[in-house]
């Protein structure tokens, strides 16, 4: 089957998420781990990472189509110090797959705002600080 | 747990210099920003400067800019606290924290390093 | 800058008495949070997020507030209860700044 990871950002308010979606077999998710990396070119790992999440098996589901699991890191506040290169990944210990989505970066502004630049799904996100809207 | 151990404090005349250093363990410490806040003797806490994770971009107090510098070794599980041109007014006590990544706050805390700037 | 001013600055209680140190902003910030400092003791992270209690912090405290006005809640003060509180705020571009501290005695 086709795996793949996508990386993507929503704001709520003040919050900013960062989301890495890995889509997936149901019976692949077993000894899946999704995790994210910031300022990290090449040894992205789950023991160096922010944030990570072990899939398991969910018997609920049925059929055999494609799913997608989710790793969400969510920021209050973003502040100069969240400025960075930042990426999702994800591997499974049973297969030996190893998944990299592209790199993304946040970018806080003398103005006191931050974009979040290189995302797949949507290209530019400016986010302003005070207004917590999207424009 | 996370440890934090400051060094390298002491008494020192004014318009010297001191540099404080701050062994972290216990955790991925390049995964972490890192900061350094004072408290003067029987006064409030007052943050000092900060320095990124993996950039290395750093920030400071207003008072401070100029003479002190924030420096990190990631190899070496430590940060550093250049300090020079002291004033009476940088006596206090300086605490290594680290930053938490999610929230504004400053989660683990070191014991500290007393700093007096007398002649 | 932000600034942030805490009342009472000083307040004995009781055990078992409900404790509430108020913290005022001087402009409108997003969230507060909350350290506890002991005699002789470097500070300890206590409520962060404005609610959200640190890990091990006994739910007899609470967090609460918005804009401008925040308040630390102790439902049944404890002698260990007694230290100062410092509340603290991040905003851009003054970064992070801290209240002056309220004394909490034990009566």
């Known amino acids: 089957g086709c795996i793949n990871i996508t990386s993507s950002a929503s704001q709520e308010g003040t919050r900013l998420n960062l989301i890495c979606t890995v889509w997936h077999k149901k019976e692949e998710a077993e000894g899946f781990v999704v995790f994210l990396c910031k300022d990290r070119s090449g040894d992205c790992s789950p023991e160096t990472s922010l944030k990570q999440l072990r899939l398991k098996r969910d018997p609920g589901i049925d059929g055999v189509g494609e799913i997608s699991s989710q790793l969400m890191f969510t920021i209050s506040q973003v502040t100069p110090l969240h400025s960075g290169t930042y990426q999702c990944c994800a591997r499974s210990q049973k297969s030996g797959i190893r998944l990299q989505g592209h790199f993304f970066s946040i970018l806080f502004t003398e103005t006191g705002n931050y974009t979040v630049t290189g995302l797949k799904q949507r290209q530019h996100l400016e986010f302003s600080h005070n207004e917590g809207t999207l424009s | 747990e996370v440890q934090l151990v400051e060094s390298g404090g002491g008494l020192v005349q004014p318009g010297r210099s001191l540099k404080l250093s701050c062994a972290a363990s216990?955790?991925?410490?390049?995964?972490?920003?890192m900061a350094w806040v004072r408290q003067a003797p029987t006064k409030g806490l007052e943050w000092v400067a900060s320095i990124s994770s993996g950039a290395g971009n750093t920030y400071y107090r207003d008072s401070v800019k100029g003479r002190f510098t924030i420096s990190r070794d990631n190899a070496k599980n430590t940060q550093y606290l250049q300090m020079g041109s002291l004033r009476s007014e940088d006596t206090a006590t300086y605490y290594c924290?680290?930053?938490?990544?999610?929230?504004?706050?400053?989660?683990?805390w070191g014991q500290g390093a007393s700093v007096t700037v007398s002649s | 800058e932000t600034v942030l001013t805490q009342s009472p600055t000083t307040t004995p209680a009781s055990p078992g008495e409900k404790v509430t140190i108020t913290c005022r902003a001087s402009s409108s910030v997003s969230y507060m949070h909350w350290y506890q400092q002991k005699s002789g003791a470097s500070p300890k992270l206590w409520i962060y997020d404005t609610s959200k209690l640190a890990s091990g912090v006994p739910n007899r405290f609470s967090g609460s507030g918005s804009g401008t006005s925040y308040s630390l809640t102790i439902n049944n003060m404890e002698a260990e209860d007694a230290a100062t509180y410092y509340c603290q705020q991040w905003n851009y571009p003054s970064m992070y700044t801290f209240g002056p501290g309220t004394k909490l005695e034990i009566k």
């Open positions: 216990r955790f991925t410490f390049s995964n972490y920003a």
């Open positions: 924290v680290t930053h938490n990544y999610e929230s504004t706050v400053f989660d683990y």
